[in-house]
């Protein structure tokens, strides 16, 4: 009687603890990807950045996939997406093709089902990096809350990739799931 | 019999409600710290900012500790960290030592166990703040998702601290826990 | 007996699943509002932006209300607030009134009970947008963690509204609830 009920209660508690822990821990995908500087494209044109670390230093990923330069969503949900992109130039690196620069980042979403790419967030600045100064630096930060479906892909495009700061604390992007889709 | 079972069910529901509420409310540390302008270092060199408010205006803290100018993690987890740093200069404040400025922020993590400091995020810009203009302003925002262990400390370093905007809406940093570590 | 207990257990499990799902899904308000470019004020003075989309493209809202140009909180909690504001100018749009610009954003909170408005976050930069360059661009990003009460309103003020970039990926603001108030 009473002993049996207690066992049932323990089962309820136990299974709930499992379910709650599982849903809390495993149902929250995230990624923080840092630039892989060994493979940054040259030039000043707008390019998609395909080389990112996902498992060294600050870089990490869970319940999302990194493949072919894109962050792939494995679980429907609302995610907070962010990117921090740093550009720098030291005169010892050589001469800029132009001192008038457009330093930009575009966070894009690609849907495989309907092959289309859309910009979710953009940021940046036009800059005049005069040769009168030995060193130049500029950082962009963007962030926003988006509905992402399983299979959708997030990628980063920048202008002037040759000016990217290769440090892991400088050039990175990421995502974390905040809530389910109703 | 049946009455007893209903009492057990109420207990299950009750204890679960407590547990769920507790885990939801108490297991989510956060902090939003705003600059304490009464104690901003002078000069143009890079310094660690140690004076922050944690309990007035927009500043607040829960399940984290603020001590010796550092935000101390009390609970392992993945946190979203952010900082907003504003610099300004009005000609009535006197002349700048140089018109070529490097306005930077560094969000650093220090581990007590292994006494070492690492930069998690950086941002900023080189600026030419010409004397032709009466007023100059520039803001930096950085944010990212990081694994933090209990006892680790977050601090903020900036260049040109004497140019910091002392308003609580201008110069602040913070963190909130998003999920547990698996 | 035993069958009845199992039924009770199923009820417990079921009701808990409902409660957990409800609390998880419905207790997490959010909004991502994108600029409505059909109604951007002109001029260079500081203005409150009242025209935002909440249900097209990337714009969305749940358990919050958008009314009279303001994002209204329906549920007490701690929220992460963010804004991304882009300014641009092309010489084909005509001449700027001045080449010295103050490009700023202010995220403000208004309490109806105590009719008062306070700035939660600000960001921006002074810029020299010289006529030597055909195109100019600049983006601001701010974000922070704030306690919001039901009935409070969030709004966005900017300087130089006529220079706003009208794209949905450029000029937007949003909020998502992270946790309850203890």
């Amino acid at each position: 009687g009473s002993q049996h009920i207690r066992a049932e209660k323990a089962m309820v508690d136990g299974s709930w603890l499992d379910l709650a822990k599982r849903s809390k821990l495993e149902a929250q995908p995230f990624a923080h990807l840092t630039i892989n500087a060994t493979d940054i494209p040259s030039g000043s044109h707008k390019v998609s950045l395909s080389s990112w670390y996902h498992d060294r230093g600050w870089a990490k990923i869970s319940n999302m996939t990194f493949s072919n330069g894109k962050l792939i969503v494995n679980q429907d949900g609302f995610y907070y997406l962010y990117a921090n992109i740093c550009f720098r130039h030291h005169e010892t690196s050589g001469d800029l093709a132009t001192e008038y620069l457009q330093l930009m980042v575009y966070v894009t979403k690609t849907s495989i089902k309907i092959p289309s790419s859309h910009t979710l967030m953009k940021g940046g600045s036009t800059k005049y990096w005069s040769g009168n100064s030995e060193f130049h630096f500029y950082s962009i930060n963007v962030g926003g809350f988006f509905k992402l479906r399983s299979g959708e892909e997030i990628s980063i495009e920048v202008s002037n990739p040759s000016l990217l700061d290769p440090d892991q604390d400088a050039t990175y992007f990421g995502a974390f799931k905040v809530r389910d889709i109703d | 019999g049946s009455q007893h079972i209903r009492a057990e069910k109420a207990m299950v529901d009750g204890s679960w409600l407590d547990l769920a509420k507790r885990s939801k409310l108490e297991a989510q540390p956060f902090a939003h710290l705003t600059i304490n302008a009464t104690d901003i270092p002078s000069g143009s060199h890079k310094v660690s900012l140690s004076s922050w408010y944690h309990d007035r205006g927009w500043a607040k803290i829960s399940n984290m500790t603020f001590s010796n100018g550092k935000l101390i993690v009390n609970q392992d987890g993945f946190y979203y960290l952010y900082a907003n740093i504003c610099f300004r200069h009005h000609e009535t404040s006197g002349d700048l030592a140089t018109e070529y400025l490097q306005l930077m922020v560094y969000v650093t993590k220090t581990s007590i166990k292994i006494p070492s400091s690492h930069t998690l995020m950086k941002g900023g810009s080189t600026k030419y703040w010409s004397g032709n203009s009466e007023f100059h302003f520039y803001s930096i925002n950085v944010g990212g998702f990081f694994k933090l262990r209990s006892g680790e400390e977050i601090s903020i370093e900036v260049s040109n601290p004497s140019l910091l905007d002392p308003d609580q809406d201008a110069t602040y940093f913070g963190a909130f826990k998003v999920r547990d570590i698996d | 007996g035993s069958q009845h207990i199992r039924a009770e257990k199923a009820m417990v499990d079921g009701s808990w699943l409902d409660l957990a799902k409800r609390s998880k899904l419905e207790a997490q308000p959010f909004a991502h509002l994108t600029i409505n470019a059909t109604d951007i004020p002109s001029g260079s003075h500081k203005v409150s932006l009242s025209s935002w989309y909440h249900d097209r493209g990337w714009a969305k809202i749940s358990n919050m209300t958008f009314s009279n140009g303001k994002l209204i909180v329906n549920q007490d909690g701690f929220y992460y607030l963010y804004a991304n504001i882009c300014f641009r100018h092309h010489e084909t749009s005509g001449d700027l009134a001045t080449e010295y610009l103050q490009l700023m954003v202010y995220v403000t909170k208004t309490s109806i009970k105590i009719p008062s408005s306070h700035t939660l976050m600000k960001g921006g930069s002074t810029k020299y947008w010289s006529g030597n360059s055909e195109f100019h661009f600049y983006s601001i990003n701010v974000g922070g963690f704030f306690k919001l009460r039901s009935g409070e309103e969030i709004s966005i003020e900017v300087s130089n509204p006529s220079l706003l970039d009208p794209d949905q990926d450029a000029t937007y603001f949003g909020a998502f609830k992270v946790r309850d108030i203890d």
Epitope: S42, E91, T92, S93, G94, D95, L96, A97, E99, S130, G131, N132, S133, E134, S162 | - | -
Partner: nanobody, 125 residues
Framework: EVQLVESGGGLVQAGGSLRLSCAAS????????MGWFRQPPGNEREFVAA????????YYADSVKGRFTISRDNAKNTVSLQMNSLKFEDTAAYYC??????????????????WGQGTQVTVSS
């Protein structure tokens, strides 16, 4: 039309000094790297010295370090090479260069976009 015009070459005895100058016209090079290469008779072209736009960084070939000094005057759009303690092996045609391709090494001749016609330096023993 962009032109780099060298001057100051000539015949000098070993141990003597010469100062080469290069005047740029057709565009401003104040924000660009400038430098000098040389080509000894019957040999390959080789790097001599280069200077960054702000003059904060200078580069020299090992063979001329401590004897040659590169400098620039951005207001006049010129770069100079002061050559002291000249040796017979410094005999060469000296070329002024400007605009170093971003990310390329300063000692690589293919890094530079503009070249002068050259001026001859002959060191007699």
């Amino acid at each position: 039309e962009v032109q780099l015009v060298e001057s100051g070459g000539g015949l000098v005895q070993a141990g003597g000094s010469l100062r080469l100058s290069c005047a740029a016209s057709g565009r401003t090079f104040s924000s660009k790297t400038m430098g000098w290469f040389r080509q000894p008779p019957g040999n390959e072209r080789e790097f001599v010295a280069a200077i960054t736009p702000t003059s904060r960084t200078t580069y020299y070939a090992d063979s001329v370090k401590g004897r040659f000094t590169i400098s620039r005057d951005n207001a006049k759009n010129t770069v100079s090479l002061q050559m002291n303690s000249l040796k017979f092996e410094d005999t060469a045609a000296y070329y002024c260069v400007a605009v170093r391709r971003y990310g390329s090494p300063p000692h690589d001749g293919s890094s530079y976009e503009y070249w002068g016609q050259g001026t001859q330096v002959t060191v007699s023993s």
